[in-house]
């Protein structure tokens, strides 16, 4: 396979990565598509040009119980609750009870390495796409989509509106994160197009919740994830020697 070739022996520099990707491009094109059925790597959806892999959580170890309160200080003013003179009944009746009766199907136990949204094998046409959250509501949110407490310096990354709070990065991410970041940079340069993966959180544990956090490729791509995966494995193997 091309990753064994000389161009892919040293993936520590960007130029080498580019060479490796160029060398592997024919192999990648010849691969079986990740989403079979429509002749290329795109899922069968209403919008085949968009490849979304929402909420990849490389870093989630087991299931967290995030029942911490998000309450702000007690002295904060209230904007959303209008004052009422008395406590009379509401003019309109409340909602009628639903007869959904749906019982939840809890996930089976804890997994040591929780990757339930890393959907290599998800059926054709399925992709996770949460609705974006705009906490500031009617204010212009292009610069500040989330509370400051959640913001982290995103070096080399664009904070897309609607994307969410980012917890502090783990110190242990280290070399693997560097490699992965280089691969992503290489992928973007290769295509010279908007390959946006700015909230693809490789190494940091979630704070309370990741919002948005999906990646999209606006142009049809060869399945570079396969290359990334193999390159990462290869790199890890080399380090182990």
């Amino acid at each position: 396979w091309c990753l064994e070739s000389s161009q892919c022996q040293d993936l520590t520099t960007e130029s080498n990565l580019l060479e490796c990707i160029r060398a592997c491009k024919p192999d990648l094109s010849a691969e079986t598509p990740m989403f079979p059925g429509n002749g290329d790597e795109q899922p069968l959806t209403e919008n085949p040009r968009k490849y979304v892999m929402g909420h990849f959580r490389w870093d989630r170890f087991g299931r967290r119980n995030s029942s911490s309160s998000g309450s702000s200080g007690a002295g904060q003013k209230r904007e959303d609750v209008s004052a009422g003179e008395d406590c009379g009944p509401l003019p309109e009746g409340g909602p009628e009870p639903r007869s959904d009766g749906a019982k939840p199907g809890p996930r089976e136990g804890k997994r040591s390495y929780s990757m339930e949204h890393f959907r290599w094998g998800k059926p054709v046409g399925k992709k996770r796409r949460p609705v974006k959250v705009y906490p500031n509501g009617a204010e212009d949110e292009s610069a500040e989509a989330f509370p400051l407490e959640f913001k982290r310096e995103l070096t080399g990354q664009r904070l897309r509106e609607g994307d969410g709070p980012d917890g502090p990065a783990d110190d242990g991410a280290g070399a693997q994160a560097d490699l992965e970041h280089s691969l992503l940079v290489a992928a973007e340069k290769k295509d010279e197009g908007p390959y946006r993966m700015e909230h693809f959180r490789w190494g940091s544990p979630p704070k309370d919740k990741r919002y948005g956090g999906f990646m999209t490729s606006e142009k049809s791509q060869t399945p570079l994830v396969t290359l990334f995966k193999n390159a990462i494995i290869k790199n890890a193997y080399k380090k182990g020697e």
Partner: antibody, heavy 114, light 110 residues
Framework: QQQLEESGGGLVKPGGTLTLTCKGS?????????MCWVRQAPGKGLEWIGC???????TYYPTWAKGRFTISKPSSTTVDLKMTSLTAADTATYFC???????WGQGTLVTVSS | DIVMTQTPASVSEPVGGTVTIKCQAS??????LAWYQQKPGQPPKLLIY???TLKSGVSSRFRGSGSGTEYTLTISDLECADAATYYC????????????FGGGTEVVVK
Amino acid sequence: QQQLEESGGGLVKPGGTLTLTCKGSGIAFSDTYDMCWVRQAPGKGLEWIGCIDTGSGDTYYPTWAKGRFTISKPSSTTVDLKMTSLTAADTATYFCAKGVSSLWGQGTLVTVSS
Amino acid sequence: DIVMTQTPASVSEPVGGTVTIKCQASEDIESDLAWYQQKPGQPPKLLIYGASTLKSGVSSRFRGSGSGTEYTLTISDLECADAATYYCQTYYDMADDGCSFGGGTEVVVK
């Protein structure tokens, strides 16, 4: 200050077609937002109809709405909801909203009756 | 599709009291949950997102908690102005029927 306003509601006969418009002020749909439609039948709860990603034009609907409801972005300041084959069950106040936020229009009432 | 079951349908508490509203998802929605307050003749207003994050400007008397499939909105030190209908909404996945509202809870303040 961003604002949304729905229009196009009114009385329509069963089987008819109606297009509602959500007009934004202080907000440009040429930017990327999730703009959604939600409805509420009189005295009932809220029901999600679908959303459009105004940047890409991608649309998303629940199974029940697919085929009969179509969300589009005809201009940089408006998002439309086209409803076909209307029945009495579609009688509701229709809201447009910016994703998950407090930015909602006041709603427009659609009454389907013969 | 994800079904949100909200309980109770209606609750009545005196001023100063506490109300607890529960929302159960038919599958794990990973805290992609919002709580809204709606008063008659008005559109809903966002109170909480991410299951527990309070929207700026909303009183800290509103508290959201939960994870997985079970979520709770707690309103403490009830005021008359809290009389409204409250809805939970999951925004987990627009692409796979993963956005829906709970049936709503009418809160009456005595």
